[in-house]
């Protein structure tokens, strides 16, 4: 059996202000059961951008439709990108629990956010 | 076993059209993106297009992008390519192959079929 | 772009390590072509990910920018170019290739 693996693609993307950022992810397995979570920075101040069972984030939408079955397709489209959305973006699965325990994280991808073309 | 099988490759002229096709078993095919990858003679690799399960999302590389068309039936397991509008750098030996987790890795490829165009 | 050394020599029953760095990728792949012409095989997938069929003197590790693939107790039958891969949809996907001959 195959180790878990989060791959995130991309080193790095680079998206004009305004427009939307597309960050990917992938997961290798659905076992073992839990969530899919994207941060921005890693460490204790790290900042939650998306859960994928709860919470409420409006400028952010799952690529793939999360209710398709055996999807391990984890990429999140961030839109309306402000200088301010610039750093580093983990995607991370949790084991299931109470609460929920951190398994693994991706490697990574830094947004950096290019002036709005006038 | 998984096993692609790649056909409709031919010889045929600037500007003509060729539709190749790749027939998948041995895995559910339903279920994997679906890419097209070519080898000009005596040059390397080089991706040309991918597909999504569903069939709903495509992928083309610059090269070929608005020439080009793939497609799938998950209903026959097959994988297909539109080629129109073909010129003498798209002769190469074009490869079906069955993308893993993530689509721009390939863990099995067909054996291949060869484009020639000509005049 | 995926950069790769054009060509590697190995002695029989040595060990070869070939390189592939650069691009945007996070992870990477290896394919090997025994002749032009003939399929692709891969090799490696995902950094480390060896599909069942292929011998265990083939290992993938990637550091950083860079991914090497190391075949161990090298064969007469290993003589081939080999293809690194990217993860990166803006990589091209594929570098140039390496030729390995085995002496």
């Known amino acids: 059996e195959e180790e878990l693996q989060v791959i995130q693609p991309e080193k790095s993307v680079s998206v004009a202000a305004g427009e939307s950022a597309t960050l990917n992810c992938t997961a290798t397995s659905l076992i073992p059961v839990g969530p899919i979570q994207w941060f921005r920075g890693v460490g204790p101040g790290r900042e939650l951008i998306y859960h994928q069972k709860e919470g409420h984030f409006p400028r952010v939408t799952p690529v793939s439709d999360p209710t398709k079955r055996n999807n391990m397709d984890f990429s999140i489209r961030i839109s309306n990108i402000t200088p301010a959305d610039a750093g580093t973006y983990y995607c991370v699965k949790f084991r299931k629990g109470s609460p929920d325990v951190e398994l693994k994280s991706g490697a990574g991808t830094e947004l950096s956010v290019r002036a709005k073309p006038s | 076993d998984v096993q692609l099988v790649e056909s409709g490759g031919g010889v045929v002229r600037p500007g003509e059209s060729l539709r190749l096709s790749c027939e998948a078993s041995?895995?559910?095919?339903?279920?994997?993106?679906m890419t097209w990858v070519r080898q000009a003679p005596g040059e390397g690799l080089e991706w040309v297009s991918t597909?999504?399960?569903?069939?709903?999302?495509?992928y083309y590389a610059d090269s070929v992008k608005g020439r080009f068309t793939i497609s799938r039936d998950n209903s026959k397991n097959s994988l297909y390519l539109q080629m129109n509008s073909l010129r003498a750098d798209d002769t190469a030996i074009y490869y079906c192959?069955?993308?893993?987790?993530?689509?721009?890795?390939?863990?099995?490829w067909g054996l291949g079929t060869l484009v020639t165009v000509s005049s | 772009a995926l950069t790769q050394p054009a060509s590697v020599s190995a002695n029989l029953g040595g060990t070869v390590e070939i390189t592939c760095s650069g691009g945007?990728?996070?992870?990477y792949g290896w394919y090997q072509q025994k002749s032009p012409g003939s399929a692709p095989v891969t090799l490696i997938?995902?950094?480390?990910n060896r599909p069942s069929n292929i011998p265990s003197r083939f290992s993938g590790s990637t550091s950083g920018s860079t991914t090497t693939l190391t075949i161990t107790g090298v064969q007469a039958e290993d003589e081939a170019v080999y293809y690194c891969?990217?993860?990166?949809?803006?990589?091209?996907?594929f570098g140039a290739g390496t030729t390995l001959t085995v002496l």
């Open positions: 192959a069955k993308s893993w987790i993530w689509w721009t890795f390939f863990d099995y």
């Open positions: 041995g895995f559910t095919f339903r279920n994997y993106y």
């Open positions: 597909i999504s399960d569903t069939g709903d999302t495509a």
């Open positions: 945007n990728s996070n992870h």
């Open positions: 997938y995902a950094d480390t």
């Open positions: 891969g990217g993860s990166s949809t803006g990589d091209g996907i």
